[in-house]
């Protein structure tokens, strides 16, 4: 049953004498494994014997052994799937039909495969895209219907006989669908490749030539042009004639139209390969080219620069840059259309020739205000001298010059006055638009450049102004020289350094921080009484009576200033001690008597000692000595001693008399 055998393999295989053939083949026998296999060459069915006749190229036996003469042909298949065959080497007489006779336990099948073996290696086939355009990448394909594992080959691309530098990609196929070797070359042809021969060369493994295929490249490209000009240097004078010729060196397809362009713009009614320019003018100077079009597009020649020579035209001056800042650099450029270019220049400043300036450019490295003005020039070439043009104005800008701050007030200025200042300058470009003042204050500017200071402070020493245009120029600071009464007057003890003790030599200084004018007078006062007119008040030997509140005054022509009251304190040992008795120095026994130690001391007495008429110290240390009840025996003379940090003082004796009471007298 033929439906049980399914084969897949290439229909025809191609090779040449001495090469090999590899036949990829698969099959399926549904009823079981392959029992025997015979490869016939040109098999024919014999009806009489019901068998196939023909050359047996290969025969497998049941025991799997293959006769030695069959080594040229190899069955590389298996019993159920693979029927791949190899013939190596393959010969011319192997051409024809190969018959694969397959037998399983119950079924038989004859599969036919065509084999085409040529005497010499057959050529590959080059495939080109339908159209090739310059600079557009194309893929060239070289296809050879051959591939065999036992016979390596290579395909090489040549351009006009030289191996092409582009790397080709070679692929092979040995499948049941197809057997081939293919080389693909990616290539961006230029117009110069048009008409050239590309070859795909088949070589063996050693690079030996086997066969080839060639094609002539048909590269579509825009016309390639050459322009020729008479005279050849394209340099003429006004009134001369010029001829330009356009030659097409290559065009594919043929060109259709011709035109001429000057400076990129098409010239009207110029549609031939020759451009004749008669009696040229300087306006005809420029870049000329011819443009020829075909179906691919327009092609342009290289440009020819036609130079029509003429004497310089009236010149103009370009200033880099105006306005210019004083101190900057400025460049003047003399511009004059001329051909050939001017070789000599004459420069003028405010109509006067500038000596030694003969170049196209004048460079002034450091601009000063006097450089301002009109600059003009004259250009000269071999054909003549041009005219002087209108010139260009150089504006030199600079900060305000000679700025001064001026005090408008009558002098001197006194603290509290209203002061008016003005800011003056000599010149400025551009004009002054604003003023600045230093230091800043809450001052009014009644008009531009005028500053009014109300109630001027004693410490307003200097003021500076700036006049500003694009820049600010500062004046030197001006001294206001504000006059004021002495400030910060105070009394300062300069001697002794420590506290004042009675008998010390004492000096007091009348200090002040500042005074303008500097000439001052001093006055010392105690309790409204004038003590002296020197800056110092001196005590050779201070007494407690000198203690008190002192003030000093300093005055100048503007006014006088008093210090705060300063208290002079004199320290002394207790003095003027006396013992006072209460209620009196005669007391009746049984009553209370209080003795008080009175003294004058600075600092106050800190410690009292009481003594009796025997100079015996009593155990009492407070200012008061209280006797209660008083006894007759208490009668006698008492004295006290006072102590402070300075020293001691003692009182004279004071006598206390205690008399008997009526009761005591009555008892007696």
């Amino acid at each position: 049953d033929s439906s049980k055998w399914v084969f897949e393999h290439p229909e025809t295989l191609y090779a040449w004498e001495g090469a090999c053939v590899w036949i990829p083949c698969t099959y399926r026998a549904l009823d079981g494994d392959l029992e025997s296999f015979i490869l016939f060459h040109n098999p024919e069915y014999n009806k009489n014997t019901s068998k196939f006749d023909g050359t047996r190229l290969y025969e497998s036996t049941k025991d799997g052994k293959v006769p030695s003469e069959q080594k040229r042909v190899q069955f590389l298949g298996d019993k159920n799937k693979n029927c791949t065959l190899s013939i190596h080497p393959v010969h011319l007489n192997d051409s024809g039909q190969l018959g694969l006779r397959m037998e399983s336990k119950t079924e038989k099948w004859m599969e036919r495969i065509h084999l085409n073996v040529s005497e010499r290696p057959f050529p590959p086939h080059i495939q080109l895209p339908p159209e090739i355009q310059e600079s557009q990448e194309v893929t060239l394909t070289c296809l050879l219907n051959f591939s065999c594992y036992g016979y390596p080959i290579q395909l090489q691309w040549l351009l006009e006989g030289v191996p092409m530098r582009q790397a080709a990609v070679t692929s092979t196929s040995l499948t049941i669908k197809s057997v081939f070797t293919r080389s693909e070359l990616k290539f961006s042809p230029q117009w110069s490749h048009h008409g050239k021969i590309v070859t795909c060369q088949l070589q063996d493994a050693d690079g030996k030539f086997l066969s080839n295929d060639t094609v002539q490249l048909n590269v579509k490209h825009t016309p390639k042009l050459e322009i020729k000009v008479t005279p050849s240097d394209a340099i003429v004078r006004e009134g001369d004639s010029v001829t330009m010729t356009c030659e097409v060196s290559s065009s594919n397809p043929e060109y259709t139209t011709v035109s001429w362009l000057k400076d990129g713009t098409s010239l009207k009614k110029q549609n031939t390969f020759t451009l004749n320019l008669r009696e040229v003018t300087k306006d005809q100077s420029g870049k000329y080219c011819c443009q020829v079009s075909n179906d691919v597009g327009p092609g342009r020649s290289e440009e020819v620069f036609l130079q029509v020579q003429y004497a310089p035209e009236p010149s103009t001056v370009q200033i880099l840059h105006s306005p210019a800042v004083e101190g900057s650099q400025v460049e003047f450029l003399c511009m004059s259309l001329a051909n050939p270019l001017p070789t000599n220049y004459t420069w003028y400043h405010n109509g006067k020739e500038m000596q030694g300036r003969t170049e196209e450019k004048v460079h002034i490295p450091k601009i000063l205000p006097w450089h301002a003005g009109t600059y003009s020039c004259v250009a000269e070439n071999i054909l003549g001298t041009g005219q002087r043009g209108p010139g260009a104005e150089l504006d030199v800008q600079y900060p305000p010059k000679k700025v001064t701050t001026v005090i408008q007030n009558p002098m001197p200025i006194r603290e509290g006055d209203t002061v008016t200042l003005s800011c003056n300058y000599n010149s400025s470009n551009p004009s002054v638009t604003r003023y600045e003042w230093k230091p800043h204050g809450a001052w009014e500017e009644p008009s531009l450049g005028v500053l009014k200071i109300q109630n001027v402070g004693w410490d307003n020493t200097t003021i500076a102004c700036a006049a500003c245009n694009s820049w600010c120029s500062w004046a030197s600071p001006v001294a206001l020289n504000v006059q004021y009464a002495p400030r910060d007057v105070r009394v300062r003890k300069i001697k002794p350094l420590s506290e004042i003790h009675s008998g010390n030599s004492v000096s007091l200084q009348c200090d002040f921080s500042s005074s303008h004018p500097k000439e001052v007078q001093f006055f010392w006062e105690k309790n409204g009484r004038l003590l002296g007119k020197e800056s110092q008040l001196n005590f050779d030997s201070i007494s407690p009576e000198d203690a008190g509140s002192y003030s000093c005054w300093v005055n100048n022509s503007i006014g006088q200033t008093a210090s705060k009251a300063w208290t002079l304190e004199v320290l002394y040992a207790p003095r003027r001690l006396r013992v006072s008795m209460s209620p009196g120095d005669q007391v009746m026994e049984g009553k209370s008597a209080t003795l008080t130690c009175e003294s004058d001391a600075n600092p106050p007495v800190s410690h009292y000692t009481w003594f009796d008429w025997n100079n015996q110290s009593l155990p009492y240390h407070s200012q008061k000595l209280r006797l209660e009840p008083v006894k007759v025996q208490h009668s006698g003379a008492y004295w006290c001693q006072g102590t402070n940090s300075v020293g001691k003082g003692r009182s004279p004796l004071s006598t206390l008399t205690v008399y008997y009471s009526p009761e005591t007298i009555g008892r007696r």
């Epitope: 351009l159 030289v162 191996p163 530098r165 230029q190 490749h193 050239k196 021969i197």
Partner: antibody
Framework: EVQLLESGGGLVQPGGSLRLSCAAS????????MTWVRQAPGKGLEWVST????????YSADSVKGRFTISRDNSKNTLYLQMNSLRAEDTAVYYC????????????WGQGTMVTVSS | EIVLTQSPGTLSLSPGERATLSCRAS???????LAWYQQKPGQAPRLLIY???SRASGISDRFSGSGSGTDFTLTISRLEPEDFVVYYC?????????FGGGTKVEVK
């Protein structure tokens, strides 16, 4: 097979002249631009001169301009380099090379010929 | 004239290592028209790379080129014994055609 074979090298005195030839085979000679490149002993490569396939256009390095002339005879498949006023610094191996465009990389090189300029 | 500077002058590496050769141009090379050549002792140079990055026919894919403008690189991915020779870069974007001074790749 493409082949480039240089000849004509040798020893020459300073101020002398020499003509190098490069015989080409295996390809369409007139289709390819040709170039001479030299290499002084132990030094790098230096481009000398190039000629277009037709022979119309030529370019030369400044170092040889006015002294060396490149030319070709397409009927004989031969490239030439006429070297006059030779100097010691012209001592080098001179290679010919082929390429498609006038300004191009060099696809195939000859094996070179040695020129020695010495007194 | 475009000056080509190759660095380093000598590159010492071991077989199997990756080699990176640099070629720097004094000005931009139009259309990246830069080629690399290999020169074995006593032989003529051989074209490896053209157009900065296109490998020439028959050249191993171990060789690759990259770069544009003024900086170009030749990379040899795995050095084989036969790769330890001299390499030159060349610009053909403008006349005069110029070569770099060369880089020698030597065995470490």
């Amino acid at each position: 097979e493409v082949q480039l074979l240089e000849s004509g090298g040798g020893l020459v005195q300073p101020g002398g002249s020499l003509r190098l030839s490069c015989a080409a085979s295996g390809f369409t000679f007139s289709s390819y631009a040709m170039t001479w490149v030299r290499q002084a002993p132990g030094k790098g490569l230096e481009w000398v001169s190039t000629i277009s396939g037709s022979g119309v256009s030529t370019y030369s390095a400044d170092s040889v301009k006015g002294r060396f002339t490149i030319s070709r005879d397409n009927s004989k498949n031969t490239l030439y380099l006429q070297m006059n006023s030779l100097r010691a610094e012209d001592t080098a191996v001179y290679y010919c090379a082929l390429h498609w465009e006038l300004l191009d990389a060099f696809d195939i090189w000859g094996q070179g010929t040695m020129v020695t300029v010495s007194s | 004239e475009i000056v080509l500077t190759q660095s380093p002058g000598t590159l010492s590496l071991s077989p199997g290592e990756r080699a990176t050769l640099s070629c720097r141009a004094s000005q931009s090379i139009s259309y990246n028209y830069l080629a690399w050549y290999q020169q074995k002792p006593g032989q003529a140079p051989r074209l490896l790379i053209y157009g900065a990055s296109s490998r020439a026919s028959g050249i191993s894919d171990r060789f690759s080129g990259s770069g544009s403008g003024t900086d170009f690189t030749l990379t040899i991915s795995r050095l084989e014994p036969e790769d330890f020779v001299v390499y030159y870069c060349q610009q053909y974007g403008s006349s005069p055609l110029t070569f770099g001074g060369g880089t020698k790749v030597e065995v470490k």
